[in-house]
């Protein structure tokens, strides 16, 4: 009789990760007695998978009848596969001998590779607002992948962005795989409602990208412009001064009147009005008695947003065409500073 | 059903020849290493001889040279020839199957029963 | 030739109990140990090989342990079916060589 081969017919097999690998494997005779073993890799640090004589192997089962003496058919199956099971594995006939099992006949491998998702695409911006004009770096991550190659693309409400970087880790073999990918975006005045989105494509996913978003609104901080002006007379000696502050994002919004540089008021924007763009307009208004004041009147809106650095507009009143009244101390009312506009 | 049937066992005289044969049905005979184990009355087990599949044959010291075991793929069977027969070998005679992957025996026969004597 | 030794050669037990018995080879025998049942006037049956792998049919109450030279059969729950005598093979090494067997009666 011919001397014992092993035969590991498919020298490749790919699965998808938390699917079954049926790893193939059948000998050429019943001689001689011994144990069939599996093994992931070669050489001394080989890593042991399955023992036909004895061990504990719970995710993997056999597709004969392995106890049987005529069997000659030792395929087993690997269940819930993951990417870390990559490799390749060898079918071992070993001589039953004393004290241990001698070694005696090996099959030529079969390489496991193992399909993976990546995982849905994180997108992260930068960690300060940016305003209008400015450029601002957007990363996007997606994590355990295999095989490698995977397609990443940059959109901004659906036009493809060209300026970005992309790396996918580690370069050399691996059992899964990471890419991170870096866009440049120049932000417009336009761009609250405006999304960023990351598209990564893999051949486990059929053809149905992930996607990964970005809204700008984290992103943006579009400063007011303001406006000061002056209404015509409510009553005798009394001018209405309103404060229009338009086209600001995000909301946060603290204003000051101040009176010839001495603080009048201070308020926090609340009822604002929302603009198509999503930038929000505020007016803010002041009853300034005119009988209080001797000389003319330098009235300031200043206007703190977002944390930033103050922005003012200032208003000169003459006081000269109207007369004074004895005896009025009160210069300024606050009596519906928040008149609701809309635009 | 997996099945051994012995037969040819009988008394015979010290000295004497005697030929046990072993019919197997239920499996493919030729697939797996066959067995003779005896056990004299009111003792242990005692194996006597073990056939591969390849003819390979494998015999104790106590009974090398007297003994010789064969088989016949082609009609299941098994056979152990016993030559220059001693009153110490008297016992059943069980043929068994090594059925299992390790030559381990899973399958035994009822047993026939040798008696050597004067 | 490796010898086979069991321990006890005979023991009484009740139904219901849990029993132990060893084998002890003089040898290593590379985990190539059978257990067999036998009673009176019937040809031994199979019920472990490889030390613990249990044969195909035989009650999940029978397990085998051990290594090296160092083996035990343990019945979990005797019952009336039980009670006949068990012997140990070593099969790595040719002379294939029994245990002299352990006779276990009902108390």
């Known amino acids: 009789e011919e001397e014992l081969q092993v035969i590991q017919p498919d020298k490749s097999v790919l699965v998808a990760a938390g699917e079954t690998a049926t790893l193939r494997c059948t000998a050429t005779s019943l001689i001689p007695v011994g144990p069939i073993q599996w093994f992931r890799g070669a050489g001394p640090g080989r890593e042991l998978i399955y023992n036909q004589k004895e061990g504990h192997f719970p995710r993997v089962t056999t597709v004969s009848d392995l106890t049987k003496r005529n069997n000659m058919d030792f395929s087993i199956r690997i269940g819930n596969i993951t990417p870390a099971d990559a490799g390749t594995y060898y079918c071992v006939k070993f001589r039953k001998g004393s004290p241990d099992d001698v070694e005696f006949k090996s099959g030529a491998g079969t390489e496991l590779s193992v399909r993976a998702k990546p995982s849905a695409p994180v997108v992260s911006g930068p960690a300060a607002r940016a305003t209008p004009q400015h450029t601002v770096s957007f990363t996007c991550e997606s994590h355990g992948f295999s095989p490698r190659d995977i397609t990443l693309k940059w959109f901004k409400n659906g036009n493809e962005l060209s300026d970005f970087q992309t790396n996918v880790d580690p370069v050399g073999e691996s059992v899964s795989y990471s890419i991170h990918s870096t866009a440049k975006v120049v932000l417009t005045r336009e761009d609250v409602h405006s999304q960023v989105i990351c598209e990564v494509a893999h051949v486990t996913l059929q053809g149905d990208p992930l996607r990964g978003t970005a809204n700008l609104s984290e992103t943006i901080r579009v400063p007011p412009t303001l406006e000061v002006t002056q209404q015509p007379v409510r009553a005798e000696n009394q001018v209405n001064v309103t404060c229009q502050v338009r086209k600001f994002y995000p909301q946060r919004l603290q204003l000051t009147w101040l009176e010839n540089g001495n603080v009048s008021r201070t308020e926090t924007a609340s009822t604002v009005t929302e603009n198509k763009d999503g930038t929000y307009n505020w007016m803010s208004w002041l009853l300034v008695n005119v009988s209080a004041h001797r000389d003319d009147v330098k009235l300031t809106c200043q206007v703190e947003h977002d944390g930033q650095p103050a922005v003012s507009k200032s208003h000169d009143l003459k006081v000269s065409a109207h007369p004074k009244e004895q005896g009025s101390n009160t210069a300024a009312e606050n009596t519906g500073s928040n008149e609701r506009n809309i635009y | 059903e997996v099945q051994l049937v012995e037969s040819g066992g009988g008394l015979v005289q010290p000295g004497g020849s005697l030929r046990l044969s072993c019919a197997a049905s239920?499996?493919?005979?030729?697939?797996?290493?066959m067995h003779w184990v005896r056990q004299p009355t009111g003792k242990g087990l005692e194996w006597v001889s073990t056939?591969?599949?390849?003819?390979?044959?494998y015999f104790p010291g106590s009974v090398k040279g007297r003994f010789t075991i064969s088989r016949e793929n082609a009609k299941n069977s098994l056979y152990l020839q016993m030559n220059s027969l001693r009153a110490g070998d008297t016992a059943v005679y069980y043929c068994?199957?090594?059925?299992?992957?390790?030559?381990?025996?899973?399958?035994w026969g009822q047993g026939t029963m040798v008696t050597v004597s004067s | 030739d490796i010898q086979m030794t069991q321990s006890p050669s005979s023991l009484s037990a009740s139904v219901g109990d849990r029993v132990t018995i060893t084998c002890r080879a003089s040898?290593?025998?590379?985990?190539?140990l059978a257990w067999f049942q036998q009673k009176p006037g019937k040809a031994p049956k199979s019920l472990i090989y490889?030390?613990?792998s249990l044969q195909s049919g035989v009650p999940s109450k029978f397990s085998g342990s051990g290594s090296g030279t160092d083996f035990t059969l343990t019945i979990s729950s005797l019952q009336p079916e039980d009670f006949a005598t068990y012997y140990c093979?070593?099969?790595?090494?040719?002379?294939?060589?029994f245990g002299q067997g352990t006779k276990l009666e009902i108390k």
């Open positions: 068994a199957r090594g059925g299992n992957w390790d030559d381990a025996l899973d399958i």
């Open positions: 239920g499996f493919t005979f030729s697939s797996f290493d």
């Open positions: 056939i591969g599949i390849a003819g390979d044959t």
């Open positions: 040898q290593d025998i590379n985990n190539y």
């Open positions: 490889t030390a613990s």
């Open positions: 093979q070593q099969y790595n090494t040719y002379p294939y060589t």
